[in-house]
Amino acid sequence: QLPPGKPEIFKCRSPNKETFTCWWRPGTDGGLPTNYSLTYHREGETLMHECPDYITGGPNSCHFGKQYTSMWRTYIMMVNATNQMGSSFSDELYVDVTYIVQPDPPLELAVEVKQPEDRKPYLWIKWSPPTLIDLKTGWFTLLYEIRLKPEKAAEWEIHFAGQQTEFKILSLHPGQKYLVQVRCKPDHGYWSAWSPATFIQIPSDFTMND
């Protein structure tokens, strides 16, 4: 029976700069029941606070709701692991909410084959930004990436869409079912997960000829 091993705060993410969650990996448990607590203070302050919500983010997590989240302050946090034989502390982690934003994936992905009479046919893809992100304030610029592939292909074709919420794809294989996904990223931060796949059957008469 030993004191617990050193825990590690390995990830902090915010969906929208208004709330955020941090997760830690426990160290070895020393063969005894171990309690974990996350404490933090804001840069420039000495007053320590305990995690306000250990539930929302799931096991080994701390969630900071709106009232605990400030964009303009750096958070300095650590996790304490304690059992009957002693304690151990993680390294301190410095967190600036501005740089840990990982939005939800875009929504309402729609895919349609367009076959204008006078031009080449194309696949038209459009989507909406995630609901938690308020683009009107100007605090956020979201960039988008699309990936698509024939159903049985192993490799995805990836297209960068910039800030657009629609995109055209010209080169497709007729008669194939295509999978399409989209994801987004703030100017500072992380790519969202890919949206669920939307699929579309490309007509056999879809022609790529001029």
């Epitope: 939800d104 994936p105 929504l107 309402e108 992905l109 729609a110 592939k149 159903e151 049985k152 292909a153 192993a154 995805w156 079912k177 999978l179 997960a193 890919w194 949206s195 669920p196 796949a197 939307t198 699929f199 579309i200």
Partner: antibody
Framework: QVQLVQSGAEVQKPGASVKVSCKVS????????IHWVRQAPGKGLEWMGN????????IHAQKFQGRVTMTGDTSTDTAYMELSSLRSEDTAVYYC???????WGQGTLVTVSS | EIVMTQSPATLSVSPGERATLSCRAS??????LAWYQQKPGQAPRLLLY???TRATGIPARFSGSGSGTEFTLTISSLQSEDFALYYC?????????FGGGTKVEIK
């Protein structure tokens, strides 16, 4: 012809873990992201999560946070779903499903009973 | 999470008649909606995706309509093999969710 063949029925005690396998044929697992769906006896369908073998990314329903692990072995074209800390309400038929929902495994009955 | 509500819970129809099943989403899912049929002891079978596109091998008597939050599955002339459970499911965003199902039974 794409087929998803799942491992056999399991009986587990509360608190234990179960690992269900899903062997893909007629397709390469790398090309096929896998959903896991379960159905308790006499109840409706419940989506558990998705595993994308191409990039190893997993997404799961919040209620399974910390209990479900979805993995895959591309060398054998087999996907796995492990559910830990089992309780009686986890008794269900577990299905693996291809990304476009038109390929379903035959289902694996997991019974949790002391 | 988007809640999918199906109605009615049970639909009693005579063979040869038309059956109309409804599915409502608590927020817009665009056209990212699938319909399934399930018979006792079997895995579900995909009928429609994209709200209205028939899956491979699905007879023309099955049709779907709707977008946004209101969707309908229509079976134009019920055959004996169509008496089963039907589920809708959105795939607009994570998590995917299913409706509670509609049982189509012989009147």
């Amino acid at each position: 012809q794409v087929q998803l063949v799942q491992s056999g029925a399991e009986v587990q005690k509360p608190g234990a873990s179960v690992k269900v396998s899903c062997k893909v044929s007629g397709y390469t697992l790398t090309a096929l992201s896998i959903h896991w769906v379960r159905q308790a006896p006499g109840k409706g369908l419940e989506w558990m999560g998705n595993f994308d073998p191409g990039d190893g990314e997993t997404i799961h329903a919040q209620k399974f946070q910390g209990r479900v692990t979805m993995t895959g072995d591309t060398s054998t074209d087999t996907a796995y779903m492990e559910l830990s800390s089992l309780r009686s309400e986890d008794t269900a038929v577990y299905y693996c499903v291809g990304v476009t929902f038109d390929y379903w495994g035959q289902g694996t009955l997991v019974t949790v009973s002391s | 999470e988007i809640v999918m509500t199906q109605s009615p819970a049970t639909l009693s129809v005579s063979p040869g008649e038309r059956a109309t099943l409804s599915c409502r989403a608590s927020q817009s899912v665009a056209s990212n909606l699938a319909w399934y049929q399930q018979k006792p002891g079997q895995a579900p079978r995909l009928l429609l995706y994209g709200a209205s596109t028939r899956a491979t091998g699905i007879p023309a008597r099955f049709s779907g309509s709707g977008s946004g939050t209101e969707f309908t599955l229509t079976i134009s002339s019920l055959q004996s093999e169509d008496f089963a459970l039907y589920y809708c499911q959105h795939y607009n965003n994570w998590p995917l969710t299913f409706g509670g199902g509609t049982k189509v039974e012989i009147k």
